[in-house]
Structure formats: C-alpha cells, structure tokens
C-alpha cells in the first residue's frame, strides 16, 4: 500500500541584515505569476551562494514569505514584491512559511511523522 | 536544475543574421530569468542580452542589432541578431536562473545565473 505524503506547515520571524551584494535571493509568485496553482503568494525560488540569507541559514527554497517589516504580500504584483524587497532598507524582517514534507506510513494508519494528534 | 539546449548557429557573411533559440526543460519556464552569453576564442565570456519579468537588457555592442524574446508556451528564449560582424564571432551560451532577484539586478554578471547550456558557434566572415 502505497503512503501518504503530509505536510507540516510552520511560521517563522526571519530577520535579515542587507550584505554588500544585498538580501541574497530570488523570489516567484505574486497575482501575475502565479508559481504555485490557486496561490498568487510569493516564494523563495534561490538563495545565493554566500548571500545574507544563506550566511543566516533559516530562510530556504520553497518558503513562502508572507509579509516584509510588516507589510503583507498578499495580492502583489510580482515586480511590486520585488520592489517592495529592494526598498526594505538595510534591516529587513520576513514573516515566513516553512513547509516540510512528510512521509508517513500506509493510509490508514498513522507512521511516526505524522504531525496530526 | 533546468536543462538548456542551443540551437541556430551557424556561418553567415557580414551583415547577415541569424536566429538562436534556447529550449529549457523546466515545467515554470515563465518564471526564470534567461540571458544570453558569448565566449570568443582568448577572450572572457561576454553578457550579450537577458529578459526577466520586467523587460530586456541588452550590451552596448549589441543594442539596435540584437533583440531577446521568449515564447513561454513553447519554454524558449530566442536570439535574433541582424547586421552582423565579424566580431560578433564567438561561441553563444544560454543561461537561466527562476525567479526574480531581490537584489539590484546585475544582467551581465554570470553568478545571477544557475544553469547553461552547453552553446552553439556563431562565425561571422
């Protein structure tokens, strides 16, 4: 019997100081480019080698950053998240969505990884 | 990793033109950033042009002769150069990185791309 794949879904505060060669990734989404279907939200698509965010090391591929220094990317405009980025100033601080793949036993029974009660 | 495949190069006279495409594997290709590279024998691989979500860039030495497209349905990225020279004589690499950075983006520095293709010979007489 084939298993089930569940995610457990966590937030974190992030916070970032600009480096020379600035914040140090890439970002898809927003209401234009939609990366992930029936969600215009915007992603972590690459951190660069030696970037602020890699030399921090919690910010990863396939996080979903909910808002900068407050401010909420809900229904962006994907070069207005850019914008929105590159204006942050020089302490920036990300709200985001970490999301862990889990793989559980056969369905019906709950594996060790399961994150439900 | 997208894998990138060159096609279109060739020998053509001075004046004449040429299109490069570039098809890319990835299932998102709208969302990358793709540019175009050129290495010349005993010279330095050279930015030529690059297109992200917001617009076309493009060097000094190809501006007004060398224009960047992509057809996103088809996961390709094409090359037209028209008016030639003999200097534009190199071998042309296609280069691709997804999404947008959050940086000051810098078209013609190699490090804001992650994968390349493995180029295609442009010879200009």
């Known amino acids: 019997m084939n298993g089930r794949v569940d995610y457990l879904v966590t937030e974190e505060e992030i916070n970032l100081t600009r480096g020379p060669s600035g914040l140090g990734f890439n970002i898809v989404g927003g209401t234009d480019q939609q990366y992930v279907s029936n969600d215009s939200g915007i992603y972590v698509s690459r951190i660069k080698e030696n970037g602020a965010a890699a030399l921090d090391g919690r910010l990863q591929e396939g996080d979903k950053i909910l808002s900068v220094n407050g401010q909420d990317l809900k229904n962006l405009l994907h070069q207005d998240a850019v914008d929105l980025f590159r204006n942050a100033g020089y302490a920036v601080s990300l709200r985001v969505q970490h999301r862990l793949q889990v793989q559980n036993g056969p369905i019906g029974h709950r594996g060790e990884g399961d994150p439900s009660g | 990793d997208v894998q990138l495949v060159e096609s279109g190069g060739g020998s053509v006279q001075a004046g004449g033109s040429l299109r490069l495409s570039c098809t890319a594997s990835?299932?998102?290709?709208?969302?990358?950033?793709m540019a175009w590279f050129r290495q010349a024998p005993g010279k330095e691989r050279e930015f030529v042009a690059a297109i992200s979500w917001s617009g076309a860039y493009y060097a000094d030495s190809v501006t007004g002769r060398f224009t960047i497209s992509r057809d996103n349905a088809k996961n390709t990225v094409y090359l037209q150069m028209n008016s030639l020279k003999p200097e534009d004589t190199a071998v042309y690499y296609c280069a691709a990185v997804i999404g947008s950075t959050v940086d000051s983006y810098r078209p013609g520095d190699p490090l804001e791309y992650d994968d390349w293709g493995q180029g295609t010979q442009v010879t200009v007489s």
């Open positions: 990835g299932r998102t290709f709208s969302t990358y950033t």
